[in-house]
């Protein structure tokens, strides 16, 4: 039932959060490296949702490093100048331009691994990341539209007669709130400067036999259900209807 809240809100969450830092990657393993990549995928763009506070690894096209001339990572983040990280194989030199975020780095030495990693993804890492590989056979691109996901904080409470409020605070993107059973509901969204959204759904149940109401919050990071028993109308010793 959850801990008793002062307002009798019963916090019941569908998922117990795992606080260990997770890592996500869209990389292919070496077996998938193909010589005829040029014929199949000269340029690939991927939309990639990544949970905030996880680690992310972004990969270049699956081109064998021995065929490489230059690798360039181009990083375009909102409100910042374009950052580039380049590696020139011939001289074994790396160069950075306008790159200030120390959490965005090569996974290891670029002559061994061309992948880019973001350690502890933050909202500010929303943006476009592109790897450009220059080879004797031409240029190959792989781009990522990285969408940072922020899990909303969910609360449920009763604020007046047979009216409950469910809030999904500071989620990215906006969460969707539904109720069991359906009530007379109004939903508002509040947009924050950091790109997160707070969704507030207020519902009233006129039907007197509704005992427990459930708020279901759907979000790309996972779903949560909370429920609460509706309190009696003040002054009512008995319900209007006996069952």
């Amino acid at each position: 039932e959850g801990a008793a809240q002062p307002n009798n809100s019963l916090m019941l969450q569908t998922s117990k959060e795992n606080h260990a830092l997770a890592s996500s990657s869209l990389c292919m393993d070496e077996k998938q490296i193909t010589q005829n990549y040029s014929k199949v995928l000269a340029e690939v763009n991927t939309s990639w949702p990544v949970k905030m506070a996880t680690n992310a690894v972004l990969c270049c096209p699956p081109i064998a490093l021995r065929n490489l001339i230059i690798i360039t990572w181009e990083i375009i983040l909102r409100g910042q100048p374009s950052c580039t990280k380049a590696y020139k194989k011939e001289t074994n030199e790396t160069k950075e331009t306008n790159c200030t975020d120390e959490r965005i780095t090569w996974v290891s030495r670029p002559d061994q691994n061309s992948d880019l990693q973001i350690r502890t993804v933050a909202i500010t890492h929303d943006g476009y990341y592109r790897c450009i590989m220059v080879t004797p056979d031409g240029n190959f691109h792989r781009g990522y539209h990285l969408q940072v996901l922020v899990t909303p904080e969910v609360t449920l409470f009763q604020n007046r007669n047979r009216t409950a409020v469910c809030k999904a605070v500071a989620g990215k993107p906006a969460a969707h709130i539904s109720w069991i059973p359906e009530g007379d509901c109004a939903t508002k969204q509040e947009y924050w400067s950091n790109g997160t959204v707070t969704v507030k759904s207020t519902c009233h149940w006129e039907v007197h036999n509704v005992s427990t109401v459930t708020c279901h919050v759907s979000h790309l990071t996972g779903n949560k259900s909370l429920y609460i028993e509706l309190l009696p109308v003040p002054g009512a010793k008995k319900s209007a209807k006996l069952y």
Partner: antibody, heavy 114, light 107 residues
Framework: QVQLVQSGAEVKKPGASVKVSCKAS????????MHWVRQAPGQGLEWMGN????????NYDEKFKSRVTMTTDTSTSTAYMELRSLRSDDTAVYYC???????WGQGTLVTVSS | DIQMTQSPSSLSASVGDRVTITCQAS??????LNWYQQKPGKAPKLLIY???NLEDGVPSRFSGSGSGTDFTLTISSLQPEDFATYYC?????????FGQGTKVEIK
């Protein structure tokens, strides 16, 4: 931790009344509904009604409403269920359950026999 | 009142078996559902709340699924201590209504 401790077994004659108690601890008694559920021997579970200790508001199942009264004593955090005009088919284990059904009392066996 | 139709009413199974119990609500209205385990002489014990959430301390071999009006309790690998009677309960509307129960017996 939340605990619901019920009164002991009772043997009653047909036509008599029984009052079962349920003493709550480990939470704010006045903030949660208390439900009463019964189970006849070898049968399923049957909801009887509930009471909100914060206001005394009650809901009774149609089947029991003429014979049951649910009350609370907030000073001792105790809920009571009184069933009148007992019949042999009222022989059952009576349970109290808090809120949304996570916590239950151990049950009270009420035997109605002549 | 919401009627809860639970099936099967009884089943025989062996240790290690996968067991599935279903519960369906009448009237086509969405409900919030709990699953309980009851052993002889004991009070019902909450296993699953809000259809698919495992109560603290309950082994992970128990799981709940479903939404709206159709729900399922699954025991992935039956253990000796799991032989008992299982009930579903809808708590959205008054009166609370229970399924008829499913007795899980040793084969």
């Amino acid at each position: 931790q939340v605990q619901l401790v019920q009164s002991g077994a009772e043997v009653k004659k047909p036509g008599a009344s029984v009052k079962v108690s349920c003493k709550a601890s480990g939470y704010t008694f006045t903030s949660y509904w208390m439900h009463w559920v019964r189970q006849a021997p070898g049968q399923g579970l049957e909801w009887m009604g509930n009471i909100y200790p914060g206001s005394g508001s009650t809901n009774y199942d149609e089947k029991f409403k003429s014979r049951v009264t649910m009350t609370t004593d907030t000073s001792t955090s105790t809920a009571y269920m009184e069933l009148r005009s007992l019949r042999s088919d009222d022989t059952a284990v009576y349970y109290c359950a808090r809120g949304t059904g996570a916590y239950w009392g151990q049950g009270t066996l009420v035997t109605v026999s002549s | 009142d919401i009627q809860m139709t639970q099936s099967p009413s009884s089943l025989s199974a062996s240790v290690g078996d996968r067991v599935t119990i279903t519960c369906q609500a009448s009237q086509g209205t969405s409900i919030n559902l709990n699953w309980y385990q009851q052993k002889p002489g004991k009070a019902p014990k909450l296993l699953i709340y809000s259809a698919n959430n495992l109560e603290d301390g309950v082994p992970s071999r128990f799981s709940g699924s479903g939404s709206g009006t159709d729900f399922t309790l699954t025991i992935s690998s039956l253990q000796p201590e799991d032989f008992a009677t299982y009930y579903c309960l809808q708590i959205t509307y008054l009166p609370w209504t229970f399924g008829q129960g499913t007795k899980v017996e040793i084969k």
